[in-house]
């Protein structure tokens, strides 16, 4: 068992261009506050787990007031340091996650309101018992010093805590098979401490809390013999060979409690004590409630009022996790519609539309046929971000509303002269042409390359094209 | 604990306007945008109108475009809609619905319980 | 607009049963579809957003799938509170549209 201990030196404008808007106003009054989660281990992995080590809160930092034009400075910290407590051994290599939360202390309705203002992570490896290491991470323009350690309680020592000491009983040397504790050498190295009951002639142990079988004996305290000659077993089926019972699976082989808790057995079933922090049948529900603030990212925390009911974070869309602490890559969402191209800006979402769409998520189709009449007798025709109106005949242009001039493209061929018709055109042929746009010739003899002309229609005739 | 609780509905006749309201509680009013939504008696729910967080980006249904204005005070956490012009068939129990944030899904993830409209001569 | 198309309009089911509503959209709305659950005197509830997520604090015995035009919800085991009217409503492109929407009632 041990403490892991966070420091905060300070929290401003990290160096280069671009220095941020100070968090607080005249008119808007704040004060800042920190939050720590750690996890064990380097792996990517641990992110699942979230803050398995622990979390703590800071204290409330002094209320700070922005001076009109001045630069934002490094802001006032809150008292004292994060400590947080873990209580089996320390793992060596950690994840860590620090958020620098904002409270504004201005007129809100229903109390302060809370923002994240930055947040570091990182992976370290670090032994208990160790100096401060000083580090510093930027988040965006802000920049976090802090400095962090971890210590064992006594009486555990060691880098992972979990060799126990004791005071010597007798000045000059320790006890049998026990070496002086290192770098307490007026101290000895104790044996350790099995689980509560565990059987000192059939048990042993080689981390503290467990209990561990010696060959032919077995249950969670090693009292239960593996195979009875006696027959007086309590469980288990009965042995074909011997005539005896051999026990069957206990009910705590492979140890149903979770999260650290021991199991022992009870007439009926097993029973688990858990760990602080934890409850449940099988210890696998956190006793941390909602007034440790357990909702990272602006979460909501929902019941969890007490240590004995379980606490919800509800996440804003962009993170995930039980505690909210995961970043979710919302571009992954396809947020923007309509073939828009997703940017995650980080403190905002972003989305470029294609022509003809708009909105912040280019939900507004522009250009659809929704309330968009095409005149004289025109459809409309929708598809893609685009529409288009399909005129009537003798109309044109985006909305049909100009009159087409149906000469304007010169349709008559061979010099024929067009005119404007109020169902189309006419073409009046020159000699020696025909048809409807005075592409044919007519031959010298007066025939037609056509088979022939139709009836009541000279060649040379103006033809009315349909 | 999300709320929303509308008022301001009411009979009055075709022709006339009235102002409905809806205050939230429990979230932080200027991160959401909000929805009005109505339902006429025995029928389908259907969306009205919306309105962005901080109110930059508003849209109407085609059918009350031009006579219902949808507005917000954030320092109040308070949504309106201004309904004018008001016809037989705008009569409905009108609903304010938080949208999601950041409007990835636009849903309307909380509801209030509606308030009742009636246009009738 | 995007017509949402609810079906069927209603069904009758016994608690334990598996239940299937199916919503079709007039065009692709690339699974923008969230499902709602309504009740006499009771606020309407989001169960469903974005096809298949499921909302916090609905249970799983609620699910969503679908894509492009088609999409379903799902009650794997009936419970006597799921007794309510259900509707569909594409996030896809203005304006927001609904389903006729589907009573579930008792057998």
């Known amino acids: 068992a041990g403490v892991f201990e966070l420091q905060i030196h300070s929290f401003g404008p990290g160096p280069g261009p671009g220095a941020p808007r100070s968090p607080c106003s005249a008119r808007l009054p704040c004060r800042l506050f920190f939050r720590v989660c750690l996890k064990p281990g380097l792996s990517e992995e641990a992110a699942e787990s979230p803050c398995a080590l622990g979390a703590a809160l800071s204290a409330r930092g002094p209320v700070y007031t922005e001076q009109p034009g001045a630069p934002a400075p490094d802001l006032p910290l809150p008292d004292g340091l994060l400590q947080v407590p873990f209580r089996d051994a320390w793992p060596g290599t950690f994840s860590f996650i620090i958020e620098t939360w904002r409270e504004e202390l201005g007129d809100q309705i229903g109390g302060p309101a809370w923002s994240l203002l930055a947040r570091v992570a990182g992976r370290r490896r670090l032994a208990a018992g160790g100096p401060w290491a000083r580090d510093i991470q930027r988040a965006g323009a802000w920049e976090l010093r802090f400095s962090y350690r971890a210590r064992c309680e006594p009486p555990a020592v060691g880098t992972a805590c979990t060799r126990l000491c004791r005071p010597r009983s007798a000045p000059s040397r320790c006890g049998p098979g026990l070496r002086p504790c290192a770098p307490l050498e007026d101290e000895c190295e104790a044996p350790l401490v099995c689980r509560a009951g565990c059987s000192p002639e059939h048990g042993f142990c080689e981390q503290p809390g467990e209990c561990r079988c010696l060959e032919g004996w077995t249950g969670p305290l090693c009292t239960v013999p593996v195979s009875t000659s006696s027959c007086l077993s309590p469980r288990g089926p009965s042995s074909a060979t011997t005539g005896c019972l051999v026990p069957g699976p206990g009910p705590c082989d492979g140890n149903p409690c979770a999260n650290g808790g021991s199991c022992s057995e009870t007439p009926r079933s097993f029973e688990c004590t858990c760990p602080r922090g934890f409850y449940g049948l099988r210890c696998e529900v956190s006793g941390v409630t909602c007034a440790d603030g357990p909702c990272f990212n602006g979460g909501l925390c929902v019941g969890g009022a007490d240590p004995d009911s379980a606490y919800i974070c509800h996440c804003p869309p962009g993170f995930q996790g039980s505690n909210c602490e995961k970043r979710v890559d919302r571009c992954s969402l396809q947020p923007c519609r309509n073939g828009g191209l997703c940017l995650d800006l980080g403190h905002a979402l972003r989305c470029r539309c294609r022509a003809g769409f708009a909105g912040p998520r280019c939900e507004h189709d522009l250009d659809d046929c929704a309330g968009r009449a095409c005149a004289n007798g025109g459809t409309c025709v929708e598809g893609g971000g685009a529409h288009r109106c399909s005129c009537a005949l003798g109309f044109g242009g985006r909305d049909c509303r100009e009159r087409a001039d149906p000469c304007a493209a010169r349709p008559c061929a061979h010099g024929g002269r067009c005119y404007a018709h109020f169902s189309g055109l006419v073409c009046a042929c020159a000699p020696g042409y025909m048809g409807a746009r005075c592409e044919f010739p007519v031959h010298p003899d007066g025939a037609s390359a056509l088979p022939a002309a139709p009836p009541g229609l000279r060649p040379g005739d103006p033809q009315r094209y349909l | 604990e999300v709320q929303l609780v509308e008022s301001g509905g009411g009979l009055v006749q075709p022709g006339g306007s009235l102002r409905l309201s809806c205050a939230a509680s429990?979230?932080?009013?200027?991160?959401?945008?909000i929805h009005w939504v109505r339902q006429a008696p025995g029928k389908g729910l259907e969306w009205v109108a919306y309105?962005?967080?901080?109110?930059?980006?508003?849209y109407y249904a085609d059918t009350v475009k031009g006579r219902f204005t949808i507005s917000r005070d954030n320092a109040k956490n308070s949504l309106y809609l201004q309904m004018n012009s008001l016809r037989a068939e705008d009569t409905a129990v009108y609903y304010c619905?938080?949208?999601?944030?950041?409007?990835?899904?636009?849903?309307?993830?909380?509801w209030g319980q509606g308030t009742t409209v009636t246009v009738s001569s | 607009d995007i017509q949402m198309t609810q079906s069927p309009s209603s069904l009758s089911a016994s608690v334990g049963d598996r239940v299937t509503i199916t919503c079709r959209a007039s065009?692709?709305?690339?699974?923008?579809l969230n499902w709602y659950q309504q009740k006499p005197g009771k606020a309407v509830k989001l169960l469903i957003y974005?096809?298949?997520r499921l909302h916090s604090g609905v249970p799983s015995r609620f699910s969503g799938s679908g894509s492009g035009t088609d999409y379903t919800l799902t009650i794997s085991s009936l419970q006597p509170e799921d007794f309510a009217t259900y509707y569909c409503?594409?996030?896809?492109?203005?304006?927001?549209?609904f389903g006729g929407g589907t009573k579930v009632e008792i057998k």
């Open positions: 309105i962005s967080s901080g109110g930059y980006t508003i």
């Open positions: 619905a938080r949208g999601d944030y950041e409007d990835i899904f636009y849903t309307m993830d909380y």
């Open positions: 409503q594409q996030g896809n492109t203005l304006p927001w549209t």
């Open positions: 065009r692709d709305i690339t699974k923008f």
């Open positions: 429990g979230f932080t009013f200027s991160d959401y945008g």
């Open positions: 974005y096809t298949s």
